[in-house]
Each structure stands twice: as C-alpha cells, then as structure tokens.
C-alpha cells in the first residue's frame, strides 16, 4: 500500500525472533488512543511480520499504525529503527493525518481484503478466475505464473497475498472486484462477520 505500510514492514522484518515476540507483548499493553481497539492476543502472538503489518494497518490505518509502531520500538530501546519510521512519517505527511481525531462512524479498519486475509486464503476456491481478472493490470506475468504454480487453492491464495503488502488501494479494489464477481456469497458472508 503506502510508504508508511512499507516502512512498518521493513522495521518489523528487521527484528529478531525474540524482538518480534517482545514487540507483540508490548503491543498488548501499550496505551492506545481513544476510539481504537486492541488486536486480540491469540491472533497477535501467531503473526509473522507480514501478518502483523497487515493487522496494524487494518486496525489503526497507516498514520496511527506508523506512530504506534514507533512508540513500541522506542519502548524496546530500538531508537534507530524508530527514527527511520519518524523520517518516513515526516516525508509522507502522515504527521497531519495522525493528528486528526478519529471521527465516530469513520472506519478504523483496513481494506476488505486485508481484514479478511485468512478467511479468503481458506475459502476462495476459484483462484484461477481471480488471477485472470488481475493478470496484467495488477499481477505481472511472473507473479501470475508463480501463483498458478502452487498446487492447492489455499497455497495459491497464500502466494497471492504475499504480493498484497506492496499493492495500492486500486490494486486491492481490483482483487475485491474479482472476488465480488466470482465469489459473491463469500464476500457477503465475510461482510456480515
């Protein structure tokens, strides 16, 4: 998605296994701004860096997600990583965005495909149809072939989602459009949940 998301992912991928564990534990107790919910402990502890980045952005959006990541990294004594994020924040203009009070009735969740990543991996069966819809516009030939090379639907979807962190909103919208076309009842079911 945006530069903030990429910066969060870079920072989390720079953490050792123990540091990532510590980051998650701190995230469970860090003071949150009013109006924001906490990522459930059970799900949080199982996440890798990519999943955690997705979750941070889906729960807190880019601007506040970036700020929260900086706070936790500073609390862990990882000043250098936090400073790198600070630079990204200033460059992207996220300062002004983060300063806004979250409005009631304004969603504080991520894009539909980020919110429902695990369910989509588990439940999308017509992956080839989805790939055909994304081929050329969103997926490169190499990415398209890499996903098709996987054997099961779940592995194909997992591979497809490995490309999602670098996507912008229009790319995610293209995936959502394809899902609405090919798996409408699944999308409706996930929306209810």
């Amino acid at each position: 998605m945006g530069r903030a998301r990429d910066a969060i992912l870079d920072a989390l991928e720079n953490l050792s296994g123990d540091e990532l564990k510590k980051f998650k534990m701190k995230l469970l107790t860090v003071q949150l701004r009013e109006g924001y919910g906490r990522i459930p402990r059970g799900a949080l502890l199982q996440m890798d860096a990519i999943d955690l980045t997705d979750k941070l952005v889906s729960y807190y959006l880019e601007s506040y997600g970036l700020e929260l990541t900086m706070t936790v990294l500073r609390d862990m004594g990882l000043q250098e990583l936090a400073e790198q994020l600070q630079t990204t924040k200033e460059e992207s203009g996220a300062v002004a965005a983060a300063a806004s009070v979250p409005a009631q009735s304004t969603a504080r969740t991520g894009h539909f495909v980020d919110q429902h990543r695990q369910a989509l991996i588990a439940r999308v069966t017509e992956v080839d149809g989805v790939l055909d819809a994304l081929h050329g516009s969103v997926l490169t030939e190499g990415q398209y072939q890499a996903v098709r090379a996987e054997t099961t639907s779940q592995d194909k979807m997992r591979k497809l989602f490995s490309f999602v962190p670098s996507w912008n909103l229009t790319c995610k919208d293209s995936l959502l459009q394809a899902l609405k076309e090919i798996h409408p009842y699944l999308v409706m079911d996930l929306e209810q949940s």
Epitope: L61, E62, G93, T106, A107, C171, K180, M188
Partner: antibody, heavy 122, light 107 residues
Framework: QVQLQQSDAELVKPGASVKISCKVS????????IHWMKQRPEQGLAWIGY????????NYNDKFKGKATLTADISSSTAYMQLNSLTSEDSAVYFC???????????????WGQGTTLTVSS | DIQMNQSPSSLSASLGDTITITCHAS??????LSWYQQKPGNVPKLLIY???KLHTGVSSNFSGSGSGTGFTLTISSLQPEDIGTYYC?????????FGGGTKLEIK
C-alpha cells in the same frame, strides 16, 4: 464531525482548465478515498473516479480519462479535481464525496461536499 | 458498464401514501446497491446501503429490498419532507453507475 468543503462556483471559457478543491475535516485525509461525481441540470449522477491520498493511487471512469485529474495535498487536507479542455458539456455541478466505511465490500457515500457549480461559456 | 434503469421517472402521490420506486441492473449486482435522496438545491443523502440496510439517522419509513438485478425502494406514510429525486447506485463494479432518478412530488 466529518465535513467536505468545496471551492466556490467557477465561470470559465471553453478550452480552459479549472481546478476544484475539496477540503476535509473531522478525519485524516489519508484514511479514506475521495470520489468525485458530476451532475448536469435535470440529469442524473455520473461517477468520475476516486483518488486515495493514503497511497496516491487513483481509479477513473473511462469516460473521464483525459478530462479529469485527481490529486490531493495531505498537508492542507485537501483533494483536488482538475478538468481540462473545457466545453459546454462540462458545465455541471461537481461533488466530492467520501465512502461511509473504508472496510466495506463496496462504497456507499455517506459524506458529500456541498457541490461546485462549473459554467463553461464564452 | 452496468446500466441502472430506474422507474418511474416521476411520481406524484398523496401524503400518507406508500410508494415504491424500482431499479433494474443490466447484470447481477448481488446486494451492492445504494439509494440516495436529493432534495431541490441540496446534495444527495444516503438512505439505504447494501440493498436493504437503513443508513444511520434515516427514517424507518424508508425501506429497501431486492438482490441480483431487481431492487425496490419503498416509502411508507409519505411526508412533505420526502419530496425530491431518488437515485439508485450500483457498487458491484467500476465504473459505479446511477439510475436516472425518480422525481417525487406531493399531490
């Protein structure tokens, strides 16, 4: 509360360009896409496209490609739509609008600017 | 593009009446349909989303139904403030498209 404040009415000559602004308040501009609609007198609404200030991406209705350019300035919490090579067909009221909920499976528009009337006349 | 055909294009009814406006999509749009009300000189206002969900703050006199290609907006116990033009909008795929509108007047 969420508000979208559009720039004032414009009277421009054929062939010229115009840039309409939409200043948002009550939320972070980077947290939602801004969509633009066109409404001609006694006609329905047409979706022009959207721009997502969170990552700079945009999606246009083919009918408005080359006519409209959508941008945003995060520092001033303002989205813009530039319309070029104006003709009388571009005379209309233009609305900026924001989906009510970012994480939905489709966009339904709960917040609207007050509209900017564009008149193209020599 | 998905075409949205709305009928009738205009409608005159008496206070207290129940009226229905229909919207037909040129292809299956499941439940991804919204209804808006636009009063003269005002901006469109969201009434119904996802075909049948009443938007926050909207009178329960409004209701929506349908899925696939056929949709209905029903206004029960018509009030003076209900005059205006009503539009349906599909959110199944880009470009989003609107119905031509139904102008509602009070007899």
């Amino acid at each position: 509360q969420v508000q979208l404040q559009q720039s004032d009415a414009e009277l421009v000559k054929p062939g010229a360009s115009v840039k309409i602004s939409c200043k948002v308040s009550g939320y972070a501009l980077t947290d939602h896409s801004i969509h633009w609609m066109k409404q001609r007198p006694e006609q329905g609404l047409a979706w022009i496209g959207y721009m997502y200030p969170g990552d700079g991406s945009a999606n246009y209705n083919d009918k408005f490609k080359g006519k409209a350019t959508l941008t945003a300035d995060i520092s001033s919490s303002t989205a813009y739509m530039q319309l070029n090579s104006l003709t009388s067909e571009d005379s209309a009221v233009y609305f900026c609008t924001r989906p009510y909920y970012f994480g939905s499976s489709y966009d339904y528009f709960g917040y609207w600017g007050q509209g900017t009337t564009l008149t193209v006349s020599s | 593009d998905i075409q949205m055909n709305q009928s009738p294009s205009s409608l005159s009814a008496s206070l207290g009446d129940t009226i229905t406006i229909t919207c037909h999509a040129s292809q299956n749009i499941n439940v991804w349909l919204s209804w808006y009300q636009q009063k003269p000189g005002n901006v469109p206002k969201l009434l119904i989303y996802k075909a049948s969900k009443l938007h926050t703050g909207v009178s329960s006199n409004f209701s929506g139904s349908g899925s696939g290609t056929g949709f209905t907006l029903t206004i029960s116990s018509l009030q003076p403030e209900d005059i205006g033009t009503y539009y349906c909008q599909q959110g199944q795929s880009y470009p989003y498209t609107f119905g031509g509108g139904t102008k509602l007047e009070i007899k």
